[in-house]
Amino acid sequence: KESCDVQLYIKRQSEHSILAGDPFELECPVKYCANRPHVTWCKLNGTTCVKLEDRQTSWKEEKNISFFILHFEPVLPNDNGSYRCSANFQSNLIESHSTTLYVTDVKSASERPSKDEMASRPWLLYR
């Protein structure tokens, strides 16, 4: 029998390499049984996760899973950083793993690193 607890399926140590100026959707996969939980996004600032109150979000419903989406329209250089989604469920707070956005500034798009180059440049990946 499957658990009826809410589960947030952001992959541990996940990363996205994205370009400033492009639109981007950051997905928080949410599994729930009956009532859809209240989900929010926050951005990590050191050990504190600052709630993103005024950002555009939406839900996408699929057969076995739902996605709570944070919209970047467009991506800005200061969107670089780590994000986490959280769900309130039966007065419990469930937190996802954090996911990191590596934003390449559109000004240096001609020198935009490939995914493999990003992996070979530890100062970009292991900040």
Epitope: K11, R12, H97, D116
Partner: antibody, heavy 119, light 112 residues
Framework: EVQLQQSGAELVKPGASVNLSCTAS????????LHWVKQRPEQVLEWTGR????????KYDPRFQGKATLTADTSSNTAYLHLSSLTSEDTAVYYC????????????WGQGTTLTVSS | DVVMTQTPLTLSVTIGQPASISCKSS???????????LNWLLQRPGQSPKRLIY???KLESGVPDRFTGVGSGTDFTLKISRVEAVDLGVYYC?????????FGGGTKLEIK
């Protein structure tokens, strides 16, 4: 049943390249990370790198940077390890390993592919 | 890179007796999420490695409770309360906290 089926043994000449495959059944690879682990005849295990098939993002052990290239095709539920400029040091068994929902816990292991580099 | 030092290299144990394998890491494996991504694998002769214990102390489904994972920070131990013949093989610790992930050198468990 959850399974990772790896391609068959390879015997290749020094300087050549090779592509090893790993096909998943019983789950969708986009929900996982797929890692590759190298095991040389003297038993030591080495993490080569991992791919997130959902977005193509890769991580490598710096020792394998330029040697290994990881790719994945979610439509065929298959991941690939490409090894270039082969030498005898690359002779090993290569395992693909899946992390369910990116847990970094090495949930499922393939049966391994034996690569022999010899002239 | 995090260096994982496993001892002993070989362990020769009588069936029914306890066994213990040590694994030390060169830096703390406590992650920012509060979990310790120290894991143990068993590779039986001619087989792929299989997960035995994960996140320090969680037992893989189907693994008997004769196996226990303990430790914290940089010092970890796999304990087998009573060794059985099916336990022979090579045991590896590995860490998934820091990139690149790294493995211990392995401990071969032999039956006396």
């Amino acid at each position: 049943e959850v399974q990772l089926q790896q391609s068959g043994a390879e015997l290749v000449k020094p300087g050549a390249s090779v592509n090893l495959s790993c096909t998943a059944s019983g789950f969708a690879i986009r929900d996982t990370y797929l890692h590759w682990v190298k095991q040389r005849p003297e038993q030591v295990l080495e993490w080569t790198g991992r791919i997130d098939p959902a977005n193509g993002n890769t991580k490598y052990d710096p020792r394998f940077q330029g040697k290994a290239t990881l790719t994945a095709d979610t439509s065929s539920n298959t991941a690939y390890l490409h090894l270039s400029s082969l030498t005898s040091e690359d002779t090993a068994v290569y395992y693909c390993v899946a992390d369910y929902y990116g847990s970094s816990l090495f949930d499922y292991w393939g049966q391994g592919t034996t690569l022999t580099v010899s002239s | 890179d995090v260096v994982m030092t496993q001892t002993p290299l070989t362990l020769s144990v009588t069936i029914g007796q306890p066994a213990s394998i040590s694994c030390k890491s060169s830096q703390s494996l406590l992650d920012s999420d509060g979990k310790t991504y120290l894991n143990w694998l068993l590779q039986r002769p001619g087989q792929s490695p299989k997960r035995l214990i994960y996140v320090l102390s969680k037992l893989e489904s189907g693994v008997p409770d004769r196996f226990t994972g303990v430790g914290s920070g940089t010092d970890f131990t796999l304990k087998i309360s009573r060794v059985e013949a099916v336990d022979l093989g090579v045991y590896y610790c590995w860490q998934g906290t820091h990139f690149p992930y790294t493995f211990g050198g392995g401990t071969k468990l032999e039956i006396k």
